[in-house]
């Protein structure tokens, strides 16, 4: 290599841990294999449950705003879910990224696709709930699931415009122990006259925006909305809260304990440009929080069937009841400070026909045995527990 | 080929000012993070000050913060120290030396002696 | 500050030989390490980086190992080039600190 051969620039951070060599050690090599096995479960489980919620509400349940913000959720976390396998051979193979740069980069991106998502649709959810309490009579004109599905399409197109710095700046940077890591590399595009600047700027961007972006903004939101809708709430004098409710709680309390570490340790990671003592507190507690980040999205389709009151009960009907039944809407159950009737203009409005898939006439084979499992596919939407439950009054 | 010369040198009585200069060539000076090394007769090396490739960031070690400044001049590739409230012990072959790439000095300068002494 | 502990401070060698010298930092400092070796009147030459990666042109008789806090430098075979001051360098946090040398001398 001549005097003046640049080498690819790193930020210092980055350089540093490129310089990190694997140990050899017995006991590390367990966590190693257990990492392996824990993170493999995770990926089967994700894509199995998330495949599930996707096809009995989004195939076999009469489509609501509810359930097209579920549809959405479990859509973001299928997508983390199938890119989990690929972070298990990485973990498998040693820590190495043997999958070269470009898949690096679509693999992070669908990471951070997630985490945009996820938050930005907790965010709609909640005020979309504050809007049904606060305007119902907006609401009711306005709330249509075609309208829900216009709103996750923007949602989604604002995930992917946030993703698109960690798309262009994920890199595979090779290790001096011949491993190679899928990371940042701020300096990739444009790194400026400084570096060091660059470095620093770049990183505590990043930083700081996903942190606001992605989790402060969309909790503000939905505290603010849970805040408006229990003051409103509370003057009409309901007390216990929807199923709904509950579900929404679980989930935003899911996603604040699984992604709130990793923002802390990203935050701390960019701080530690400008003081290296934080870096190994970094390096040894950053992929213990990506996989929390990550396991997010395996919880919340067991979520969304545990927060059905009398669970084990309704376990043992088909998951399409229990899923129907947990997402009921509120104003399809008359809630709270609207009248008890059948409101037949917002059913309608929410069963539009933005269904994902097609009802078949009668399933035959193993589709019997889904059909079973699932609920009977051929059931008219009019005759199922969510139509029923339209004429009772809110739990 | 890779040249750092050291100049500005000197005796100086405590107290005083020198200004030393590093003319560098042979590599694209601006991409590079520089600094200086200094050796007391028959001692050892002691790192003094470092500056980023754009000079936006330096760092020193306690021994001459405050008292020493690093700079550089990328248009004329060129690195400096200015060294204030010299002292005795200040008295050294001062080296100026280029990052390898964050770190590990891979070329360095001659050096020239820098002489505090009344 | 982190301190750098080389030892031995000097020792003697033949042609041929092979000869460890060892560098212990007062606290981890993650490979974060360079080795150089200087000969009277002359400006250091880096060795050694990030604690096991041999720098350019110099001989692969050179190699460096370690980890964690305890550093080593090793000359498989010493040359009559060879016999010159060592220092290590860590590079870990500010202020990066040299060990004080081990001077080899020819036996």
């Known amino acids: 290599m001549s005097a003046n051969a640049t080498l690819k620039p790193l930020c210092p951070i980055l350089e540093q841990m490129s310089r990190l060599q694997s140990h050899s050690n017995t006991s590390i090599r367990y966590i190693d294999h257990a990492a392996v096995l824990l993170h493999g479960l995770a990926s089967l489980l994700g894509l199995v449950e998330n495949g599930v919620i996707l096809f009995v509400v989004g195939c076999r349940m009469r489509q609501t705003v509810v359930t097209t913000w579920v549809l959405h959720l479990a859509l973001s976390d299928l997508l983390a879910s199938a890119s989990l396998p690929f972070f298990t051979y990485f973990l498998a193979v040693g820590h190495s990224w043997e999958l070269g740069t470009t898949f690096c980069k679509l693999h992070s991106s669908i990471f951070f696709l997630n985490m945009f998502a996820s938050g930005f649709l907790l965010s709609a959810i909640s005020l979309d709930r504050c809007l049904q309490v606060v305007r119902p009579v907006w609401a009711q004109n306005h709330r249509t699931v075609a309208a829900a599905h216009k709103v996750c399409l923007v949602l989604w197109a604002l995930a992917v415009l946030n993703t698109v710095p960690y798309f262009v700046f994920r890199d595979t940077i090779s290790r001096l122990d011949g491993r190679i890591m899928c990371y940042y590399n701020v300096l990739l595009l444009n790194p400026g006259p400084d570096r060091d600047a660059t470095c620093n700027s770049r990183q505590v961007a990043l930083a700081v925006s996903k942190f606001l972006l992605a989790f402060l903004v969309p909790l503000a939101i939905i505290a603010s909305s849970h805040a408006a809708v229990s003051l409103r709430l509370q003057h009409r004098g309901r007390r216990r809260p929807g199923r709904f409710v509950r579900l929404v709680a679980a989930v935003v309390a899911a996603f604040a304990l699984c992604w709130g570490p990793y923002h802390v340790f990203s935050l701390l990671e960019a701080r530690a440009h400008a003081n290296p003592g934080l870096r190994p507190l970094v390096w040894r507690g950053l992929p213990f929080v990506t996989s929390l980040a990550f396991f997010n999205s395996v919880a919340n389709p067991v979520l969304y069937v545990l927060t059905c009151p009398d669970m084990l009960r309704k376990l043992r009907r088909s998951l399409r009841t229990v899923l129907e039944s947990v997402l009921v809407d509120d104003s399809e159950l008359g809630g709270a400070g609207s009248s008890r009737r059948r409101r037949t203009s917002s059913t309608a409005r929410s069963a539009s026909p933005l269904a994902l898939c097609s009802r078949p006439e009668e399933p035959r084979g193993p589709a019997r045995l889904l059909g079973w499992l699932l609920g009977s596919c051929a059931a008219s939407p009019q005759t199922g527990p969510l139509n029923r439950a339209l004429s009772s009054t809110s739990s | 080929e890779v040249q750092l010369v050291e100049s500005g040198g000197g005796l100086v009585q405590p107290g005083g000012s020198l200004r030393l200069s590093c003319a560098a060539s042979?590599?694209?000076?601006?991409?590079?993070?520089m600094s200086w090394v200094r050796q007391a007769p028959g001692k050892g090396l002691e790192w003094v000050a470092y500056?980023?490739?754009?000079?936006?960031?330096?760092d020193y070690p306690g021994t001459v913060e405050g008292r020493f400044t690093i700079s550089r001049d990328n248009s004329k590739n060129t690195l400096y120290l200015q060294m204030n409230s010299l002292r005795a012990e200040d008295t050294a072959v001062y080296y100026c030396?280029?990052?390898?790439?964050?770190?590990?000095?891979?070329?360095w300068g001659q050096g020239t002696l820098v002489t505090v002494s009344s | 500050d982190i301190q750098m502990t080389q030892s031995p401070s000097s020792l003697s060698a033949s042609v041929g030989d092979r000869v460890t010298i060892t560098c212990r930092a007062s606290?981890?400092?993650?490979?974060?390490l360079a080795w150089y070796q200087q000969k009277p009147g002359k400006a250091p030459k880096l060795l050694i980086y990030?604690?096991?990666q041999l720098a350019d042109g110099v001989p692969s008789r050179f190699s460096g190992s370690g980890s964690g806090t305890d550093y080593t430098l090793t000359i498989s075979s010493l040359q009559p080039e060879d016999f010159a001051t060592y220092y290590c360098?860590?590079?870990?946090?500010?202020?990066?600190?040299f060990g004080q040398g081990t001077k080899v001398e020819i036996k």
């Open positions: 606290e981890n400092i993650y490979w974060n």
């Open positions: 030396a280029r990052h390898r790439t964050n770190w590990d000095f891979d070329y």
């Open positions: 042979g590599f694209t000076f601006s991409s590079y993070s």
């Open positions: 360098q860590h590079f870990w946090i500010t202020p990066w600190t």
């Open positions: 500056i980023s490739n754009g000079g936006s960031t330096t």
């Open positions: 990030a604690a096991t």
